[in-house]
């Protein structure tokens, strides 16, 4: 990659090890934990990021635990199995042979079972609702300014095309960002909504995954937008399969 090729770092993923051993002495970066090569011009997949996060030594971890207000993905952090493309494998198991099925963002979508559990396919999360509550401000933000700023942010910081930002809703102090992306809608080079939402979530928590870039500084017409809580809801193309016992 080229970003910071002089000192050979990965601008889009600080949880990498980089060295100038690529073709023609180019800087090549590999994700911690998996050792997989990553493209530093775009977001690293959530699966590889979770794997890297779990591989970091406990005392050296620069990342903090999710806040009590966050909707924790899949019963908390886990060390996922990723496929050769860096996507979540449909079936995930822990060291005690407890297994479950996940969706494309790595969130559990079935009851837990044993090694005999089958997960036929990786079910795509096609709709993500990011629910934010902002800190009090002098007045409400202008809705169209807020919409434009969030679309710009998702394009420029997370490389997500505005076509995938389906809507931005605002009722002070709640902001809802709807991301939608069917499998067929993704063209070559398009960022996955699940990866963009994960980077955004980590930015909001002050745990930026970007190398050397400042933290997220969200402003709407110069007015700082400070988020005090985030909830993220995931909707899959096929509804999840939980037993009734879990739902009561």
């Amino acid at each position: 990659h080229t970003a910071a090729q002089d000192n050979c770092t990965c601008p889009t993923n600080k949880m990498t090890v980089c060295s100038p051993d690529g073709p023609g002495g180019r800087c090549q970066c590999r994700a911690l934990g998996s050792g997989m090569a990553v493209d530093c011009s775009t977001l690293t997949s959530k699966c590889l990021l979770l794997k890297a996060r779990m591989s970091a030594p406990k005392n050296a971890r620069t990342l903090v635990r999710p806040s009590e207000h966050a909707l924790v993905d899949n019963d908390g952090l886990y060390d996922p199995d990723c496929d050769p493309e860096g996507r979540f494998k449909a079936r995930q198991c822990n060291q005690t042979s407890v297994c479950w099925c996940v969706n494309s963002v790595g969130v559990r979508r079935t009851d837990k079972g044993d090694l005999s559990l089958r997960c036929d396919e990786l079910v795509r999360t096609h709709h993500i609702l990011i629910d934010l509550r902002h800190r009090p401000t002098a007045g409400a933000f202008n809705h169209s300014d807020l919409d434009a700023e969030l679309r710009r942010l998702f394009r420029e910081r997370y490389r997500l095309h505005p076509k995938f930002v389906a809507a931005v809703h605002y009722e002070q102090p709640t902001i809802q960002i709807e991301l939608r992306q069917n499998t067929s809608q993704k063209a070559a080079g398009d960022v996955d909504i699940g990866d963009a939402a994960y980077y955004f979530e980590r930015d909001i928590k002050g745990e930026s995954l970007f190398q050397g870039r400042g933290g997220l500084d969200l402003r709407v017409r110069g007015e700082p937008l400070q988020v005090e809580r985030t909830l993220i809801y995931y909707l899959d193309e096929i509804p999840p399969k939980f037993s009734m016992k879990r739902l009561t």
């Epitope: 970003a3 394009r155 420029e156 809608q185 070559a188 398009d190």
Partner: antibody, heavy 119, light 108 residues
Framework: QVQLVQSGAEVKKPGASVKVSCKAS????????MHWVRQAPGQGLEWMGE????????SYAQKFKGRVTITRDTSTSTAYMELSSLRSEDTAVYYC????????????WGQGTLVTVSS | DIQMTQSPSSLSASVGDRVTITCRAS??????LNWYQQKPGKAPKLLIY???RLHSGVPSRFSGSGSGTDFTLTISSLQPEDFATYFC??????????FGQGTKLEIK
């Protein structure tokens, strides 16, 4: 190999419309963005708009909104660009170009279609 | 919209020369900068994408560098077929994606 073949040159009167076609081959048409760029005689390149053939999503440069329409026919792997209310300053070579979603680089281009607007 | 400014607008050089063309963006565009070559009567051809990545089939005498707002296209040793017009283009922001005005490279 990737090829984008455009329709032939057109001469139009002011106020008329023109529709230029761009037939893609050598790759999966629905897997890439398609962009339209124009170049007036002796001038630079000007981006007009884009389409994702998979879902027919389009976006246009503000300058052309209301006058340009980009469409596609997935059965023939063809993209179209229609420009209406033509004026003399629309005389240009119009190009279709395949685009990448992240870099927004245009890696393959059609040969160009010269549209001349003259009374 | 992001403005792209190329310099020089024209340049005379000889075969074997090392040539540098610069492109400046009106705001930070990270590394989302592409370079194209265009010959008279022909469509542009992608040379370099994402600042320094060579498109397939492009000779290694072409190279790109830069980050943020300032970018450079370098031809290490000019060949007769390199005399053409070169355009930079940013792919960073929301549409529209904008081009520089072009640099015409002529034989001295």
């Amino acid at each position: 190999q990737v090829q984008l073949v455009q329709s032939g040159a057109e001469v139009k009167k002011p106020g008329a419309s023109v529709k230029v076609s761009c037939k893609a081959s050598g790759y999966t048409f629905t897997s890439y963005w398609m962009h339209w760029v124009r170049q007036a005689p002796g001038q630079g390149l000007e981006w007009m708009g884009e389409i994702t053939p998979s879902d027919n999503y389009t976006s246009y440069a503000q300058k052309f909104k209301g006058r340009v329409t980009i469409t596609r026919d997935t059965s023939t792997s063809t993209a179209y660009m229609e420009l209406s209310s033509l004026r003399s300053e629309d005389t240009a070579v119009y190009y279709c170009a395949r685009g990448h979603g992240n870099y927004v680089s245009f890696d393959y281009w059609g040969q160009g279609t010269l549209v001349t607007v003259s009374s | 919209d992001i403005q792209m400014t190329q310099s020089p607008s024209s340049l005379s050089a000889s075969v074997g020369d090392r040539v540098t063309i610069t492109c400046r963006a009106s705001q930070d565009i990270s590394n989302y900068l592409n370079w194209y070559q265009q010959k008279p009567g022909k469509a542009p051809k992608l040379l370099i994408y994402y600042t320094s990545r060579l498109h397939s089939g492009v000779p290694s005498r072409f190279s790109g560098s830069g980050s943020g707002t300032d970018f450079t296209l370098t031809i290490s040793s000019l060949q007769p077929e390199d005399f053409a017009t070169y355009f930079c283009q940013q792919g960073y922001s929301l549409p529209p994606y904008t081009f520089g005005q072009g640099t015409k490279l002529e034989i001295k």
